[in-house]
Interface confidence: low
């Protein structure tokens, strides 16, 4: 399921314009496209240009993160007069040009979406024949990837004074709420750490002191689903070890 905020009835809304109004460079992209992890998404991008009948060599580029300087995720080149844009780069083989650059369409399909794909993408076209010109979307399209929760790590770790603490890390978008349950706990919402830089979809909850032996279950939930995982604490009484 893919949602795209776009309305072709208003040119200036999502259009970035350069040059004179009569014949100008412009790029039309929606501000946001949403899709679920595992699915595919289409990033629309169309353009106009002032070089009326240009049929020389062209290059289509998509980059991620930021315009002009972000890493390229896709690049293809079309020879003079050709409508075939030969792929030169497709990061992890998951990016494929849907549009025809000769027909002013750079739309890109992204396969097998992951949470890491949730970022802003920028399309660019370069002419390199008798005309040398280029234009790049400055504001780009935000790809918003949603995902049901997944617990990526659950563990019991030693704490000072022969105590133990439990950590549960989950990912999802929207970021999942985490809850611990276990012996003498009932249902505890535990301390949730802020997502770490560069790991915006990861949430960690800690149980700082495990006071009883038994099974401790971490549940992660968001609007798309829930997931749970358990660890077991069994202390060898009289010793300082634990079995998990």
């Amino acid at each position: 399921f893919v949602r795209t905020k776009i309305d072709t009835t208003e040119n200036l809304l999502n259009t970035e314009v350069h040059s004179s109004p009569a014949q100008r460079w412009s790029m039309q992209v929606p501000p946001e496209v949403s899709a679920e992890a595992g699915d595919a998404a289409v990033l629309p991008c169309t353009f106009t240009h002032p070089h009326r009948h240009y049929d020389g060599p062209l290059t289509a580029i998509w980059r991620a993160g930021e315009p002009y300087a972000g890493p390229q995720v896709f690049r293809c080149a079309a020879a003079r007069g050709s409508e075939l844009c030969q792929t030169a780069l497709s990061l992890h083989g998951r990016f494929r040009l849907l549009g025809n650059p000769r027909r002013n369409d750079l739309s890109l399909r992204v396969e097998r979406l992951a949470l890491a794909d949730d970022r802003r993408y920028f399309c660019r076209v370069e002419f390199a024949g008798d005309v040398h010109d280029r234009y790049e979307s400055r504001h780009g399209v935000r790809l918003h990837v949603t995902a049901a929760p997944r617990i990526v790590n659950i563990s019991v770790l030693p704490s000072p004074a022969h105590a133990f603490r439990a950590l549960c890390t989950a990912e999802g978008e929207p970021p999942p709420a985490l809850a611990w349950s276990g012996p003498a706990l009932g249902n505890s919402l535990a301390a949730v750490r802020s997502p770490r830089e560069g790991h915006g979809h990861l949430v960690t909850a800690e149980l700082p002191a495990l006071t009883h032996d038994g099974r401790y279950t971490c549940t992660a939930a968001n609007s798309l689903g829930r997931s749970e995982a358990s660890v077991y604490l069994f202390r060898f009484h009289g010793a300082s070890g634990a079995s998990t």
Epitope: K5, D7, N11, E16, R120, R138
Partner: antibody, heavy 122, light 107 residues
């Protein structure tokens, strides 16, 4: 001269309505997204709403969604904010602001009006 | 929503001082950050956009830097007219959000 001039503020009771206007001059009004930004007394700035150049797209802060309506009349170079079901927490100076670029997803607000005070009180 | 956090909330300085104000975003906003100056009873004035571009007519003693989540506004040599409140604002995504402001006062 490039400028924005707000009007329509005043004292209104909770649950009441007001319509703010912002008259633009000195630039091609229809080419730019316009926004309303407010500032409660002694507080910081809060974005309220944005409308795209042609008026097709409108966006609102959660705090005003369903109560406020942004609109524009490009033939009159005027931006509006219709405020219904007003609450005490809507008390603020309301500024209209122009986006720096012609794309709706613009970087910043490069032109601001002088502001109009809205007081919601019984 | 993206939260913008400015520090410090207030700073005292003297004419001629170099002053730095920082702004942190709760998530990566690339370079989509603006800085504004506001004086009491007046509308905000744009100083810097896309993190480091100086708005036309703004003195060159103002500069901006940063990308991602951490940004800085620097005033290289304070002038008497610079004492005001400064706000950062992200335009990476709607809702646009502002920092809480940094009040620059005379020492």
């Amino acid at each position: 001269e490039v400028q924005l001039l707000e009007s329509g503020g005043g004292l209104v009771q909770p649950g009441g309505s007001l319509r703010l206007s912002c008259a633009a001059s000195g630039f091609t009004f229809s080419s730019y997204a316009m926004s309303w930004v407010r500032q409660a007394p002694g507080k910081g700035l809060e974005w309220v709403s944005t409308i795209s150049g042609g008026g097709v797209y409108t966006y609102y802060a959660d705090s005003v969604k369903g109560r406020f309506t942004i609109s524009r009349d490009n033939s009159k170079n005027t931006l509006y904010l219709q405020m219904n079901s007003l609450r005490a927490e809507d008390t603020a100076v309301y500024y209209c602001a122009k986006a720096i670029g012609s794309s709706w997803y613009s970087d910043a607000f490069d032109l601001w009006g002088q502001g109009t005070m809205v007081t919601v009180s019984s | 929503d993206i939260q913008m956090t400015q520090s410090p909330s207030s700073v005292s300085a003297s004419v001629g001082d170099r002053v730095t104000i920082t702004c942190r975003a709760s998530q990566d906003i690339s370079s989509w950050l603006a800085w504004y100056q506001q004086k009491p009873g007046k509308a905000p004035k744009l100083l810097i956009y896309v993190a480091s571009s100086l708005q036309s007519g703004v003195p060159s003693r103002f500069s901006g830097s940063g990308s991602g989540t951490d940004f800085t506004l620097t005033i290289s040599s304070l002038q008497p007219e610079d004492f005001a409140t400064y706000y950062c604002q992200q335009s990476y995504s709607i809702p646009y959000t502002f920092g809480q402001g940094t009040k620059l006062e005379i020492k």
